[in-house]
Structures are given as C-alpha cells and as structure tokens.
C-alpha cells in the first residue's frame, strides 16, 4: 500500500504529545524531506 | 511565486574570500534541496553543489570540494555558498536553483535565481 | 566523470521549422534534464527525466532517449524558442551539463 505523508505527520504529533505528557519526553521534529540524492532515480514522472 | 535572490557577488583577488546568499520565498524551503551552478562568460553551465532539504547531504563536484562550502538557514530561508581560496577559473555567474528531487525520483533543477557575478582577478 | 557532447552545437532555422537537438553521454544514464537559456536570461527548465514537459512548458517541446543518447524535439519554432539548450545528467556525480546547442534564427 501506499503511505500519505500527512498522516504519518498527524500521527506523530500525537505521538509527540503523548511522549511529553507520560513521559515527560520532548521530540523536536522530525524531518520527512532530508533525504540523500536519488542517484539509482529512473527516468519517468 | 516561488523567488530566488541571489547576492555577495564582486570583485575579488586570487586567493581571496567571499560568500554568496540567496534569499528564497514563496515555498517551504526545508522541503528541498537547493544547488549552486556557475557560468563562466561564454561557456557551459557547471554544477557547483548541492545541499538536501534539511543539510544532512552534501555534494560538490572535484573543482570545488575542500575551498566552497554550502550551508542553509532553514529558520532565515537562505541559502549559503561560502567560497575560499579563489581562482581566476571561478570568475562567472552564480546561479542559486531549487532542487526537485525526492528518495526515489529527480525532477530538475525546477527555479533559478538570476545569478550574481563573481569575478576573480588581481 | 561522465561527459555530455550535445550536435549540433548551432542550429539555423525558421519560425514554423522543427528543431531537432541530440546530446550523447560518454557512459549510459537513466534520465537527462533539458534547460533553456535565453541571451541575458537565467536558465529554466523545460523537460525534466528524459520526457516530462515542466510546468509552464508548452506541447511543442518534447523529449525522448534513453542509455547514452537523448534528443530534444521542438515541433513548431516560435520566436521566443531561438535559445541556448543544454542537457544535464544527475545519474552520477559529479552532475554534468551538455556543451549546449544555440538555435538562431535564419
């Protein structure tokens, strides 16, 4: 299947929040565009 | 509207030192990678480096690697390209662009700014 | 380093006339990128991985290719397709651009 970014970044907001409040943890951001080049990319859109 | 303003262009001496910026707007800068490719007067466009959206990935070809160094403000929206030990051969426009490419794809180097001339000479 | 030689490097044609442009890679890539340079002009990009038209870019242009040797069609030239051209490959660094071909006006 297919993974939607946005969902994957509600979820981690949530998890994020229950991280601080259970166990007083605090996760800055996690970033989903920092990715190496794509140097084995083929051709097509 | 997606705009590229690059300066710190000029007139430097061999040997000598200079950083370019560019200021980008209109897109979420983190979520690109952004390059730097020059053009010398006349001649074919070379690529100079290339940085990821958040700064892990850092790419420049052997003409440049050990004196330019790229480096990105995500929290200003401005990219950097720190040049150092300069020579004659670096004289030419600098061209900040934006990267379109992702984990498993390449889209090009989809917006250019309208470059800043550097130009190295005693 | 992987070298892209791009024929002819001037091309004189007519508005209305096809353009047809090559450019050749001293070892084989996945995908090439074309660009557009007007005299005094940034670059921009016109067809991206091999076959893509860019946002903006009309039909006319068109791409095709694959291994070492790539072509860049213009169907129809209007007045403001009289450019420089490259190609680029990213399939390997360092990234490299072609030599160019210039399509001026008869």
């Known amino acids: 299947g297919t993974i939607n970014v946005h969902d994957v970044e509600t979820q981690f907001n949530q998890y994020k929040t229950e991280a601080a409040s259970r166990y007083n943890l605090t996760i800055s951001d996690v970033s989903v565009s920092d990715v190496p080049f794509p140097f084995s990319a083929q051709s097509g859109a | 509207e997606v705009q590229l303003v690059e300066s710190g262009g000029g007139l430097v001496k061999p040997g000598g030192s200079l950083r370019l910026s560019c200021a980008a707007s209109g897109f979420t800068f983190s979520r690109y990678g952004m390059s730097w490719v020059r053009q010398a007067p006349g001649k074919r466009l070379e690529w100079v480096s290339t940085?990821?959206?958040?700064?892990?990935?850092?790419y420049y070809p052997d003409s440049v690697k050990g004196r330019f160094t790229i480096s990105r403000d995500n929290a200003k929206n401005t990219l950097y390209l720190q040049m150092n030990s300069l020579r004659a051969e670096d004289t030419a426009v600098y061209y900040c662009t934006r990267d379109n490419y992702g984990r498993n794809y390449d889209y090009g180097m989809d917006y250019w700014g309208q470059g800043t001339l550097v130009t190295v000479s005693s | 380093e992987i070298v892209l030689t791009q024929s002819p490097a001037t091309l004189s044609l007519s508005p209305g006339e096809r353009a047809t442009l090559t450019c050749s890679a001293t070892?084989?890539?996945?995908?090439i990128h074309w660009y557009q340079q007007r005299p005094g002009q940034s670059p921009r990009l016109l067809i991206y991985s091999t076959s893509n038209l860019a946002s903006g870019i009309p039909a006319r242009f068109s791409g095709s290719g694959s291994g070492s040797d790539y072509t860049l069609t213009i169907s129809s030239l209007e007045p403001e397709d009289f450019a420089v051209y490259y190609c680029?490959?990213?399939?390997?660094?360092?990234?490299?651009f072609g030599s160019g071909t210039k399509v001026e006006i008869k």
């Open positions: 070892s084989s890539v996945s995908y």
């Open positions: 940085i990821s959206g958040g700064g892990t990935y850092i």
């Open positions: 680029q490959q990213r399939s390997s660094s360092p990234f490299t």
